[in-house]
C-alpha cells in the first residue's frame, strides 16, 4: 500500500530515533565530563557533539548558563540542569501539545511528529480536510481542530456511512402544513394553497390574499376569497381593459347614422312635456291662425302644437292619439275633442296644416282636409288694443290634466319647413341651427334610441296577488328586450331599491367573464352583484337580438336569440339569490331602462349606460318611454337611427 509522503515519514521517524538512542546517551555522559564538571571551550564542545550545527546551537547557550548560574566550579545545581537540557531540543517541548504525537531531538534542531489532522513545524496548524474533495462529504464538510465531520442541509439526514445524505419526507408528518397541501421537495417541503391564497406558517392554514392592498385595480377593487375583481366607473363611460385591472373608454363598436338635420325641429326634447318652442304673436290688425309644417313620427301619442290664450280662454291643441290626429279646442270655456284622418305615425314625412277661417278650423294632411270644425270666435284675443296669440310646439303652456281630454304630451316627432302665420320665421331657424339637441336625426327607424348617456325609469309592481284570498302573493319578472347595440357594455334593464340603494336585478351587456377573467361578449343576468346566468352574444354585428329573462319563485332563465344561457350558481345559491330578489320586490323598487342611477360600481356587474336601439317588454307589457316616470332627454322614445351602411 502506498502512503502519501508526509504520512510515510511520520511512520518511519520513530524507528530512526531508536537507532540514535545509544549515541545520544553516550553523548550526554561525555558532555557531563567535559562541560558540566569542567569549563569547556568551543573546540571541546565540538569534540562532544562531533558536528558544527549542534555546537553552534549549544555553545552560545552554554555561555548564557554560565552568565546565569556561574561557572561549573561554583557547583550550582541550576547550572548543571541548564547545560544538560541544552542539547535536547525537545526540552522544553517546542511542539504544540494538542497536535503533537512526539518531539524528536535533532542535531541542533527538533522535529514535531504530528497527530492526524494537524500539521506545521510545531504541529499547531489544523489540517483542513474539507479543502480537498469536500473531505469526502456529499453535502456539508465541517472542519474541526484536528478533525472534520460531514453533515447535511436542512431537510436531509446523514446516512450511516457518515458521508452521504438522504432526503427527509416532511410530508409524512400530517401536521407539517396543517390545512394546506404538503408537497415534499428535495431537502425541503412546501405548503401549497390555491391561487389567491397564501400560506400562513403561524396558523398553518391558507389565508386569502387581499389583492386590493397591492393596488392592482385602476379604480375600484373588490377582494373575494381567492380572487379579486376590478370595477370601472361605467356611468363615466369606462369599462375594464383586456388586462382586467385597468379601465378604458366604452367606445361604439357599431356606427349608427346619428347625423342630424339643421333644418329640422325635434319635438321630443323636453321630457317634462313642456314645449320645445314658445312663440308669441301680437298684432294691431286682427289676424287668423295659419300653421303649416312637414311632420314625421313613429310615436302614437303626443302634442304637436297649441295655439291660443291662457288655459281658461280660447285655444286649440293639435295632437296625436293612437296614431291619428286629434284636435282639442276650448272656445269661451266650452271644450270639444275631434279625431279624424288616417294613421300618420308611420315614420314618413307628411304636410300638416291648421287654418283658421271665418267660422271654421280646417286641418289638412298632405293638402287633404281631414277635419273641418265649426268654431265661434277667434284664437287671437284682443287685450289693451292688441291681438295676442301664444303658439307652442311639442307641448302646452299648462298642465295636461287641464286639457279637454288628458293626453300624454310627449311626442317623439320631427318637424321641418314650418310656417307660422304665413310669416318668415328666422328666429326658430337660428336657434335650432346652433342647438343640435333641437334637431332631429336625419333618418330614423322604429324603436327607442339610448345614446349611452342616460336612463329612463318606471314605477312598476312585480308582486301578484292570486284571486283566491288568503294565499301568499307571488312574484314574476319577465323581460323581453329587442336590442340593436352600438356598444359592447351597458345596462339593458335593472331594478333599483332606492331605500337600500341596492340593485336587486340587472340584465346587461358585458365584454368579460368576471370570475374567469376572460374577455368575452356576454349578456349577464344578476341579482345584486352576483351573476346568475351568462349567455354569449354577437353584440357588434349590427343585427337585432332578442334577450329574454324570466324569473319567478324557484327559477331564473336567460335566453339570447332563443338559446338558453349558462347558470353561474348552484341550485342552493340560486334559491338564496331569488329569495333576496323577492325580499326587494316586496318593498318599493324602480324599473330602470338603459342604465342605473348613481350607485356604487360594485352594486351590479355593469353600471354603464346602454348605447343602441332597444324596446322593452316587461311582464308582457311593452314599455312606452313617454310613459316613464323619468327619461333622459337624449333618449328618443319612438325612433332610432339606423346602422350606418358599410363603406364600399
Amino acid at each position: 500500500a502506498l502512503l502519501p509522503a508526509r504520512e510515510a515519514t511520520q511512520f518511519l521517524r520513530p524507528r530512526q530515533r531508536r537507532a540514535f538512542q545509544v549515541f545520544e546517551e553516550a553523548k550526554q555522559g561525555h558532555l557531563e565530563r567535559e562541560c558540566v564538571e569542567e569549563l569547556c571551550s568551543r573546540e571541546e564542545a565540538r569534540e562532544v557533539f562531533e558536528n558544527d550545527p549542534e555546537t553552534d546551537y549549544f555553545y552560545p547557550r552554554y555561555l548564557d548558563c554560565i552568565n546565569k548560574y556561574g561557572s561549573p566550579y561554583t557547583k550550582n545545581s541550576g547550572f548543571a540542569t541548564c547545560v544538560q537540557n541544552l542539547p535536547d531540543q525537545c526540552t522544553p517541548n517546542p511542539c504544540d501539545r494538542k497536535g503533537t504525537q512526539a518531539c524528536q531531538d535533532l542535531m541542533g534542531n527538533f522535529f514535531c511528529l504530528c497527530k492526524a489532522g494537524w500539521g506545521g513545524r510545531l504541529c499547531d496548524k489544523d489540517v483542513n480536510e474539507c479543502s480537498q474533495e469536500n473531505g469526502g462529504c456529499l453535502q456539508i464538510c465541517h472542519n474541526k481542530p484536528g478533525s472534520f465531520h460531514c453533515s447535511c442541509h436542512s431537510g436531509f439526514e446523514l446516512s450511516s456511512d457518515g458521508r452521504t445524505c438522504q432526503d427527509i419526507d416532511e410530508c409524512a408528518d400530517s401536521e407539517a402544513c396543517g390545512e394546506a397541501r404538503c408537497k415534499n421537495l428535495p431537502g425541503s417541503y412546501s405548503c401549497l394553497c390555491d391561487e389567491g391564497f397564501a400560506y400562513s406558517s403561524q396558523e398553518k392554514a391558507c389565508r386569502d390574499v387581499d389583492e386590493c392592498l397591492q393596488g392592482r385595480c385602476e379604480q375600484v377593487c373588490v377582494n373575494s376569497p381567492g380572487s379579486y375583481t376590478c370595477h370601472c366607473d361605467g356611468r363615466g363611460g369606462l369599462k375594464l381593459s383586456q388586462d382586467m385591472d385597468t379601465c378604458e373608454d366604452i367606445l361604439p363598436c357599431v356606427p349608427f347614422s346619428v347625423a342630424k338635420s339643421v333644418k329640422s325641429l325635434y319635438l321630443g326634447r323636453m321630457f317634462s312635456g313642456t314645449p320645445v318652442i314658445r312663440l308669441r304673436f301680437k298684432r294691431l290688425q286682427p289676424t287668423r291662425l295659419v300653421a303649416e309644417f312637414d311632420f314625421r313620427t313613429f310615436d302614437p301619442e303626443g302634442i304637436l302644437l297649441f295655439a291660443g290664450g291662457h288655459q281658461d280662454s280660447t285655444w286649440i291643441v293639435l295632437a296625436l292619439r293612437a296614431g291619428r290626429l286629434e284636435l282639442q279646442l276650448r272656445y269661451n270655456g266650452v271644450g270639444r275633442v275631434t279625431s279624424s284622418g288616417p294613421v300618420i305615425n308611420h315614420g314618413m314625412w307628411q304636410t300638416i296644416s291648421v287654418e283658421e277661417l271665418a267660422r271654421n278650423l280646417v286641418i289638412k294632411v298632405n293638402r287633404d282636409a281631414v277635419m273641418k270644425i265649426a268654431v265661434a270666435g277667434d284664437l287671437f284675443q284682443p287685450e289693451r288694443g292688441l291681438y295676442h296669440l301664444n303658439l307652442t310646439v311639442g307641448g302646452i303652456p299648462f298642465h295636461e290634466k287641464d286639457l279637454v281630454q288628458p293626453i300624454n304630451p310627449r311626442l317623439d316627432g320631427c318637424m321641418r319647413s314650418w310656417n307660422w302665420l304665413n310669416g318668415e320665421d328666422t328666429t326658430i331657424q337660428e336657434t335650432v341651427k346652433v342647438n343640435t339637441r333641437m334637431q332631429c336625426f336625419s333618418v330614423t327607424e322604429r324603436g327607442s334610441f339610448y345614446p349611452g348617456s342616460g336612463f329612463a325609469f318606471y314605477s312598476l309592481d312585480y308582486m301578484r296577488t292570486p284571486l283566491d284570498v288568503g294565499t301568499e302573493s307571488t312574484w314574476e319578472v319577465e323581460v323581453v328586450a329587442h336590442i340593436r347595440p352600438a356598444a359592447d357594455t351597458g345596462v339593458l334593464f335593472a331594478l333599483w331599491a332606492p331605500d337600500l340603494r341596492a340593485v336587486p336585478l340587472s340584465v346587461a351587456l358585458v365584454d368579460y367573464h368576471s370570475t374567469k377573467k376572460l374577455k368575452k361578449q356576454l349578456v349577464v343576468l344578476a341579482v345584486e352583484h352576483t351573476a346568475l346566468a351568462l349567455m354569449e352574444i354577437k353584440v357588434c354585428d349590427g343585427q337585432e337580438h332578442v334577450v329574454t329573462v324570466s324569473l319567478r319563485d324557484g327559477e331564473a332563465t336567460l335566453e339570447v336569440d332563443g338559446t338558453r344561457g349558462q347558470s353561474e350558481v348552484s341550485a342552493a345559491q340560486l334559491q338564496e339569490r331569488l329569495a333576496v330578489l323577492e325580499r326587494h320586490l316586496r318593498s318599493p323598487v324602480l324599473t330602470f331602462a338603459g342604465g342605473l342611477p348613481d350607485v356604487p360600481v360594485t352594486s351590479a356587474p355593469v353600471t354603464a349606460f346602454y348605447r343602441g336601439c332597444m324596446t322593452l317588454e316587461v311582464n308582457r307589457r311593452l314599455l312606452d318611454l313617454d310613459e316613464a316616470a323619468y327619461k333622459h332627454s337624449d333618449i328618443t322614445a319612438h325612433s332610432c337611427p339606423p346602422v350606418e351602411p358599410a363603406a364600399a
Epitope: 304673436f281 298684432r283 288694443g385 292688441l386
Partner: antibody, heavy 116, light 107 residues
Framework: QIHLVQSGPELKKPGASVKISCKAS????????MNWVKQAPGQGLKWMGW????????TYTEEFKGRFVFSLDTSVTTAYLQISTLKAEDTATYFC?????????WGQGTLITVSS | ETTLTQSPSSLSVSTGDRVTITCITS??????MNWYQQKPGKPPKLLIS???TLRPGVPSRFSSSGSGTDFTLTISSTQPEDFADYYC?????????FGQGTKVEIK
C-alpha cells in the same frame, strides 16, 4: 325677402299737402297692418298710428288726429300717408313699419321738409 | 297711455366698455319691452323683442333684462359699430310708445 320701399324726400311750403308712399313686397300685404312713425330732426321716435290692410280702417294717436290720413291701394300693395296744411313742426322723417305687435321691418324713411 | 323714461339721454364710452341703458315705464307692462338701435340716416333696427328675446343676427354682447316697470339694455363690451342711438318701445298697450332715446358716443 320682405321689403318696404318709401317714396323720396319732399320739400314743401307751410299750408301745402304731401302724400308719401310705402310699397310692400315679399309677403301677403293684407296679412299685416301698416304703421307710421315720425322722427323729427335730432329727436326721438313717435308712433303715429296704423292702418288695417284688410279693411282699410285707420287708427291715429291723439297727436296725429286731423291733418293726417292713412290710406291703401291693395292692388299695388302700397300704403300712403297724407299730411295736409303742412306746418314747420311737420318737418321730419316718416317711416312705415309692418305690424307685428312690434316693428321688425321698416321702410327706409321719407324726409319731409316744410319751409317757407 | 304708458310713458317711458329712458336714461341716460347720452353717454360717452370707449370701445370695450360695458354700457347699461334703462327704461322705466309708468305702468306694469309685464315683459312687453323691445329695444332698437338706430344709426344716422337709417331706420331703427330691432335688437331685442318682447320677453327679452335676442333677435336673429344680433350679437350676443347685447342683452336685456327686466319685467314690470324696470328694464335694462346692456352692451357687455362696446364695439365701434355699436355707437348709435338706442330706443325702448313698449308693446303692451295702445298707443305704442317709445323712450326718448340714448345716444352712445365715442369718448
Amino acid at each position: 325677402q320682405i321689403h318696404l320701399v318709401q317714396s323720396g324726400p319732399e320739400l314743401k311750403k307751410p299750408g301745402a299737402s304731401v302724400k308719401i308712399s310705402c310699397k310692400a313686397s315679399g309677403y301677403t300685404f293684407t296679412n299685416y297692418g301698416m304703421n307710421w312713425v315720425k322722427q323729427a330732426p335730432g329727436q326721438g321716435l313717435k308712433w303715429m298710428g296704423w292702418i288695417n290692410t284688410n279693411t282699410g280702417e285707420p287708427t291715429y294717436t291723439e297727436e296725429f288726429k286731423g291733418r293726417f290720413v292713412f290710406s291703401l291701394d291693395t292692388s299695388v300693395t302700397t300704403a300712403y300717408l297724407q299730411i295736409s296744411t303742412l306746418k314747420a313742426e311737420d318737418t321730419a322723417t316718416y317711416f312705415c313699419a309692418r305690424d307685428e305687435g312690434w316693428f321688425v321691418y321698416w321702410g327706409q324713411g321719407t324726409l319731409i321738409t316744410v319751409s317757407s | 297711455e304708458t310713458t317711458l323714461t329712458q336714461s341716460p339721454s347720452s353717454l360717452s364710452v370707449s370701445t370695450g366698455d360695458r354700457v347699461t341703458i334703462t327704461c322705466i315705464t309708468s305702468t306694469d307692462i309685464d315683459d312687453d319691452m323691445n329695444w332698437y338701435q338706430q344709426k344716422p340716416g337709417k331706420p331703427p333696427k330691432l335688437l331685442i323683442s318682447e320677453g327679452n328675446t335676442l333677435r336673429p343676427g344680433v350679437p350676443s354682447r347685447f342683452s336685456s333684462s327686466g319685467s314690470g316697470t324696470d328694464f335694462t339694455l346692456t352692451i357687455s363690451s362696446t364695439q365701434p359699430e355699436d355707437f348709435a342711438d338706442y330706443y325702448c318701445l313698449q308693446t303692451d298697450s295702445v298707443p305704442l310708445t317709445f323712450g326718448q332715446g340714448t345716444k352712445v358716443e365715442i369718448k
